[in-house]
């Protein structure tokens, strides 16, 4: 029951991870135009990993998108990159999760399947969300550079008489966002490796040994296994969990998503 | 069809108050007060976001005007109190629009500060 | 605050004259979200309201006629009547749309030669 419960709730927590993460790769309000001096001010510029915005105290807004793909800075393409990675990583996981589910029966699943599953989508979120902390740290880090960089320039003087509004961009709706969503993920794959490890119990494999009564056709077996009648007929103790040593079709059949990054 | 039309404008003496109204009909997100005194140019009041009522004053009247809405009423108001003789102008409300340009202006209502 | 500053303040023209008339601002008025600056042109009758003719410093406003031109960028900008017309005897009016607190300029009349 309770490896039941940690799989759900590592499957639930990991699906709103991912939501987030999609959410947050989305969102433009990545970088939002630092209101140092000026809380309401009459042009507000924010960015995010696909266009820029601009807001006017007017009400209107317009958003230019990035059309240009070499012309955008590495760092920003790495972002992206890490964003979906992480993307498509959470939803192979989430895919394979559900069929690893101890509470949906598939055919006749065996719990070794199961588990080996729980354990590859476990892997999956934490990689996942990994992706997505790095990438919306890696942006923040970025944020930071360029904020002290602009702040420096403020400062340096002009020479003239006429001032240049330098635009400062500070930490946007988007990085806690991504930071909170990546974190369930992470919290949810490690989870569900948990799960697969209560799905697989350890046991030691004893050979079988058989006592003939007489009149009987008994098959006595050690560590609690049900007697079987017959002779020979269940000698061998099943191995429920390899570690991951077999190669599943299940898992193994999943189209590869790099393409895409 | 955006229209606005102000009211509440007259004499008032130093030191006293003064509420003047601008009755708006059609799509307004912001909009502004703008004075000009006589023979003079323009001014520029105070902004609100219609929405979130969110405030902002040009500094010479911060703490003496107040700019408001009713939502229900649909109109703007501007509070002036502590009025002085500079006062005397010409009030207009604006709405604001792309590119904060102030397209639909008011008649304008005259308020004239004297003892 | 932004200072926004017009010449000349006034101006004699004929009928038919092309007409240019500037605005400087203290600090520039230029957007680097969307590359645009923030600088409106407004026409004024004697007891009327303001007109707004130009935003974003060259864009017209719909129903303005298109012998009205606006450049610049920056903290210079320039407002441009190609052919003068009876009906365009008024004073001019720049404005900085940028920053609150929102600044005009002092104004530009044209009148009659």
């Known amino acids: 029951m309770a490896v039941t419960a940690c799989q759900g709730l590592g499957f639930v927590v990991s699906l709103i991870g991912i939501a987030g993460i999609i959410a947050a790769t989305c969102m433009d309000q990545w970088s939002t135009q630092d209101l140092y001096n000026n809380p309401v001010t009459a042009v507000f510029n924010y960015q995010g990993l696909w266009r820029s915005c601009v807001r006017e105290s007017s009400g209107f807004t317009e958003c230019r998108g990035y059309f240009t793909l070499l012309g955008l800075p590495a760092m920003l393409q790495a972002v992206r990159a890490l964003m979906i990675v992480g993307i498509v990583l959470g939803a192979i996981g989430l895919l394979v999760s559900i069929f690893a589910l101890k509470c949906i029966r598939i055919g006749s699943m065996e719990d070794s399947a199961k588990a080996n599953m729980t354990l590859t989508s476990g892997i999956m979120f934490i990689v996942s969300g990994l992706c997505a902390i790095a990438g919306v740290s890696v942006f923040a880090n970025m944020l930071v550079t360029n904020f002290w960089m602009s702040t420096a320039n403020m400062y340096t003087g002009m020479g003239g008489m006429v001032q240049t509004v330098q635009t400062r961009y500070t930490f946007g709706a988007a990085l806690f966002v991504g930071w909170v969503a990546g974190g369930l993920t992470l919290i949810g794959g490690v989870m569900m490796c948990i799960a697969c490890r209560g799905l697989a119990p350890e046991e030691t494999n004893y050979k079988a040994v058989s006592y003939h009564a007489s009149g009987h056709s008994v098959a006595y077996k050690p560590g609690g296994f049900k007697a079987s009648t017959g002779f020979g007929s269940n000698t061998k103790n099943k191995k429920i969990y390899d570690g991951g040593a077999r190669t599943e079709d299940e898992v193994q059949s999943y189209p590869s998503k790099h393409d895409y990054v | 069809e955006v229209q606005l039309v102000e009211s509440g404008g007259g004499l008032v003496q130093p030191g006293g108050s003064l509420r003047l109204s601008c009755a708006v009909s059609?799509?307004?997100?912001?909009m502004n007060w703008v004075r000009q005194a006589p023979g003079k140019g323009l001014e520029w009041v105070a902004w609100?976001?219609?929405?979130?009522?969110?405030?902002t004053y040009a500094d010479d009247f911060k703490g003496r005007f107040t700019i408001s809405r009713d939502d229900s009423k649909n109109t703007l108001y501007l509070q002036m109190n502590s009025l002085r003789a500079e006062d005397t102008a010409v009030y207009y409300c604006?709405?604001?629009?792309?590119?904060?340009?102030?397209?639909?202006w008011g008649q304008g209502t005259l308020v004239t500060v004297s003892s | 605050d932004i200072q926004m500053t017009q010449s000349p303040s006034s101006l004699s023209a004929s009928v038919g004259d092309r007409v240019t008339i500037t605005c400087k601002s203290s600090?520039?008025?230029?957007?680097?979200?969307?590359?645009?600056?923030?600088l409106t042109w407004y026409q004024q009758k004697p007891g009327k309201a303001p007109k707004l003719l130009i935003y974003?410093?060259?864009t017209l406003e719909s129903g303005v006629p298109s012998r009205f031109s606006g450049s610049g960028s920056g903290t210079d900008y320039t407002l441009t009547i190609s052919s003068l017309q009876p009906e365009d005897f008024a004073t001019y009016y720049c404005?900085?749309?940028?920053?609150?607190?929102?600044?005009f300029g002092q104004g530009t009349k044209v009148e009659i030669k």
């Open positions: 600090q520039s008025l230029l957007n680097s979200g969307n590359q645009k600056s923030y």
């Open positions: 974003w410093a060259s």
């Open positions: 604006a709405r604001l629009v792309r590119g904060n340009g102030m397209d639909y």
């Open positions: 404005q900085n749309a940028y920053s609150f607190p929102f600044t």
């Open positions: 609100i976001n219609m929405y979130t009522g969110e405030p």
């Open positions: 059609g799509y307004t997100f912001s």
